[in-house]
Interface confidence: low
C-alpha cells in the first residue's frame, strides 16, 4: 500500500475519550475520587504494557483493569490476566501479542473493586502508541573512496512502517548531525574525511504510514568508521544518552 497524502485527522490525540463515571445522583454526598490515567505502549508489536500511577491512590488499592475493542464480535470487557505490581499493589497490565489489534479502538477500563461505581474508561488508538526496538546490526560499507553507506535492521516490524532518525558526527564535531530517513533502512554519507573518526547511531518510530507514534525507540548501539590516529578530548565528545 502506498499513501498519496498523509492523513489529516487528529491522530495525535491518543487519549481520545476519558469518561469518568461517578456515583448515582442519590449518593452524591461524598465526591468520587478520580482514578489515575492509564498509559499504554505497544512494544515492537510483541506485547503491550498499560500502566497507572498506583501511588496516587490515597490508600493502597488493587485497581483492576478490563479491556475490549470498540468493534468486535464479543463486546464484553475482559479482565487483565497478567497484572504488573508496584510494592505489591497493581500498577499495570501486560497484554500479549495475540490480544493486540492495532487498528481498532482499544477501550480500557480502570476500576476500584471496593467501589464499583468508581471507574474510568479511556479509548486509545494503539497504532499511535507503538515503540519499536532499537535498530540492530548497523553495518558500514564504502560505496566509493569518500562515500559511506550505513545499513541496519529492525526486528518484527515492516520497514515501510518505520521512520528513522540517523545521527552522526566526527571526532572533530561538538554536536550531532541528524536527519530523518523514511522507510528505507539505509543512509549514505556522500563525503567523508578519512582522517576523521565517525560515529553513527539510529533510532526509529512507527510513523507516518502505519501509525502516528511520536515515541522514538532507544538508540542503536553506535558504530564507528575511520582513523584512530586523531585524538581529541574525549570528555567533549562523549555520546549522549
Amino acid at each position: 500500500w502506498s499513501s498519496k497524502v498523509l492523513m489529516s485527522s487528529a491522530n495525535e490525540d491518543i487519549k481520545a475519550d476519558l469518561i469518568l463515571t461517578s456515583t448515582a445522583p442519590e449518593h452524591l454526598s461524598a465526591p468520587t475520587l478520580p482514578l489515575p490515567e492509564v498509559q499504554c505502549f505497544v512494544f515492537n508489536i510483541e506485547y503491550m504494557n498499560c500502566t497507572w500511577n498506583s501511588s496516587s491512590e490515597p490508600q493502597a488499592t488493587n485497581l483492576t483493569l478490563h479491556y475490549r475493542y470498540k468493534v468486535s464480535d464479543n463486546n464484553t470487557f475482559q479482565e487483565c490476566s497478567h497484572y504488573l505490581f508496584s510494592k505489591e499493589i497493581t500498577s499495570g497490565c501486560q497484554i500479549q501479542k495475540e490480544d493486540i489489534q492495532l487498528y481498532q479502538t482499544f477501550v480500557v477500563q480502570l476500576q476500584d473493586p471496593q467501589k464499583p461505581q468508581r471507574r474510568a474508561v479511556q479509548k486509545l488508538n494503539l497504532q499511535n502508541l507503538v515503540i519499536p526496538r532499537a535498530p540492530e546490526n548497523l553495518t558500514l560499507s564504502n560505496l566509493s573512496e569518500s562515500q559511506l553507506e550505513l545499513r541496519w535492521k529492525s526486528r518484527h516490524i515492516k520497514e515501510r512502517c518505520l521512520q528513522y532518525l540517523v545521527q552522526y558526527r566526527s571526532n572533530r564535531d561538538r554536536s550531532w548531525t541528524e536527519l530523518i530517513v523514511n522507510h528505507e533502512p539505509r543512509f549514505s554519507l556522500p563525503s567523508v574525511d578519512e582522517l576523521k573518526r565517525y560515529t553513527f547511531r539510529v533510532r526509529s518510530r512507527y510513523n507516518p504510514i502505519c501509525g502516528s507514534s511520536q515515541q522514538w525507540s532507544k538508540w542503536s548501539q553506535p558504530v564507528h568508521w575511520g582513523s584512530h590516529t586523531v585524538e581529541e578530548n574525549p570528555s567533549l565528545f562523549a555520546l549522549e544518552a
Partner: nanobody, 134 residues
C-alpha cells in the same frame, strides 16, 4: 448505523473500464474512512483502495496503482472506484466498507492510517460482481 449499497459491476473484456459506486446512507458521512475491498473465489478479501473523507487522503494496493482511482461525492454521499485497464485477475466480488471516527476531545479521530485491514472497518456493503474475461 451506516448502510452501504454497491452498484456498477458487470462483465468486461481485458483492457476495458468500469466505474463502481457505493451509496452511503443512515448516518453522517463527513468523517469516515471509506474503502473498496475485493474477494476472488477461494481467496481472502483484500484491500484495493481507501479514502479518508475528512482530508482527502487516498491509499491504493500496489496491484491497482495507476489503474484504479478512488473518489467521492460528499453531496451525494457516494463513493466511487474508477477501474481502467482491467485484467482477468481483477475478477472478484467488490465490497464497499466504511470506518467511523471516534469522538475525541480534540475532534474526530479516525482509528486507521493505512486502510489495509478488514478489521479497521465497521460497516460493509453486500458487494457487486466484476468479471474480466475475453
Amino acid at each position: 448505523q451506516v448502510q452501504l449499497q454497491e452498484s456498477g459491476g458487470g462483465s468486461v473484456q481485458p483492457g476495458g473500464s468500469l466505474r463502481l459506486s457505493c451509496a452511503a446512507s443512515g448516518s453522517t458521512y463527513a468523517n469516515y474512512l471509506m474503502g473498496w475491498f475485493r474477494q476472488a473465489p477461494g481467496k481472502e478479501r483484500e484491500g484495493v483502495a481507501a479514502i479518508y473523507s475528512g482530508g482527502g487522503s487516498t491509499y491504493y494496493a500496489d496491484s491497482v496503482k495507476g489503474r484504479f482511482t478512488i473518489s467521492q461525492d460528499n453531496a451525494k454521499n457516494t463513493l466511487y472506484l474508477q477501474m481502467n485497464s482491467l485484467k482477468p485477475e481483477d475478477t472478484a466480488m467488490y465490497y464497499c466498507a466504511a470506518a467511523s471516527a471516534v469522538k475525541g476531545d480534540k475532534g474526530d479521530i479516525v482509528v486507521v492510517v493505512t486502510g489495509t485491514q478488514r478489521m479497521e472497518y465497521d460497516y460493509w456493503g453486500h458487494g457487486t460482481q466484476v468479471t474480466v474475461s475475453s
